[in-house]
């Protein structure tokens, strides 16, 4: 089948990184600079994406693959193929339309992106709070009091104190 197809269409023999040049009797010509073909049998090479301004080059364009961009420092990629950039926040914050805002009491975010999520409710699993939650970290649940062997010291969860200067939004 391959032999038949190539007899019918000489372009099918052109590998990735080349194009079938109609101006040169359908011979396989290398992709010109700043262009690529990621599959064989192409009649043209595609122009490489340019990562400029808000974007930086993560992977250079080659004759067989497009360039890949990421975002300028302080931002991270959003959208297919990093088509836009979203502002980073600090851990303990989430991004709103007006910028980065601290997580409300009872929620946390341990990443530079994404939203603040509620602390785990240990009691739903019949457990107790071993380590209190913060804006940046979830609570750590410990064994339930019933799981503790006689004589073992139980961790009493301290009342969730508000962090200084932090009020719920």
């Amino acid at each position: 089948f391959e032999r038949t197809r190539s007899l019918q269409d000489p372009c099918s023999n052109c590998p990735a990184g080349t194009f079938c040049d109609n101006n040169r009797n359908q011979i396989c010509s290398p992709c010109p600079p700043n262009s690529f073909s990621s599959a064989g049998g192409q009649r043209t090479c595609d122009i490489c994406r340019q990562c400029k301004g808000v974007f930086r080059t993560r992977k250079e364009c080659s004759s067989t693959s497009n360039a890949e961009c990421d975002c300028t420092p302080g931002f991270h990629c959003l959208g297919a193929g990093c088509s836009m950039c979203e502002q980073d926040c600090k851990q303990g914050q989430e991004l709103t339309k007006k910028g980065c805002k601290d997580c409300c009491f009872g929620t946390f975010n341990d990443q530079k992106r994404g939203i603040c999520r509620p602390w785990t409710n240990c009691s739903l699993d019949g457990k107790s709070v071993l380590v209190n939650g913060t804006k940046e970290r979830d609570v750590v649940c410990g064994p339930s009091p019933a799981d503790l062997s006689p004589g073992a010291s139980s961790v009493t969860p301290p009342a969730p104190a508000r962090e200084p200067g932090h009020s719920p939004q």
């Epitope: 301004g53 297919a80 836009m84």
Partner: antibody, heavy 124, light 107 residues
Framework: QVTLKESGPVLVKPTETLTLTCTVS??????????VSWIRQPPGKALESLVH???????FFSTSLKSRLTISKDTSKSQVVLTMTNMVPVDTATYYC????????????????WGQGTMVTVSS | DIQLTQSPSFLSASVGDRVTITCRAS??????LAWYQQKPGKAPKLLIF???TLQNGVPSRFSGSGSGTEFTLTISSLQPEDFATYYC?????????FGQGTKVEIK
Amino acid sequence: QVTLKESGPVLVKPTETLTLTCTVSGFSLSNARVGVSWIRQPPGKALESLVHIFSNDEKFFSTSLKSRLTISKDTSKSQVVLTMTNMVPVDTATYYCARNGGFGVIIHDAFDIWGQGTMVTVSS
Amino acid sequence: DIQLTQSPSFLSASVGDRVTITCRASQGISSYLAWYQQKPGKAPKLLIFAASTLQNGVPSRFSGSGSGTEFTLTISSLQPEDFATYYCQQLNNYPRTFGQGTKVEIK
């Protein structure tokens, strides 16, 4: 408030050189995320990109007009200057400058702010 | 350079109509496409970037879709202020190129 304003001659003669200035305010031309483009539009026709300049002085020109165009910027004056040599009547158009490299929580590289444009007529 | 072809070039529609404009790229450009609206005597205004993301302040009746070589701009219910010319622009590489425009006129 972010603005761009084009200025330059309203009328140029064939074979003369056109010099247009884009004065920006509300942002800095030294910001690494920002680029400024010149775009033109002949009466009743489509938009045509001419040239783009970034803060690092990297420049990208229209393939068909490259030999006639120069672009420079003066960051201290907040100005981007376009020159186009050997003007001909078909260069009659409204010339716009526009910024790309959005500001805010989501940034992109479409042209988010445009000047109001300046109409240039090429005639003897 | 990447060529963009818009269809139709002219479109007559009535207030309340759903309007769809197509933009085809001469090569794949992923979702690196923007849409602009231009009214007579005015500069273009950015409506959509990254093929489908609405610019701040643009009414939600505007939407964009598509990826690769085929893109659409849809106005779900045409308003009197939407009669204008619409342009697509590729954001894949420099120089940026535009489509030839689609003029939306009152029927």
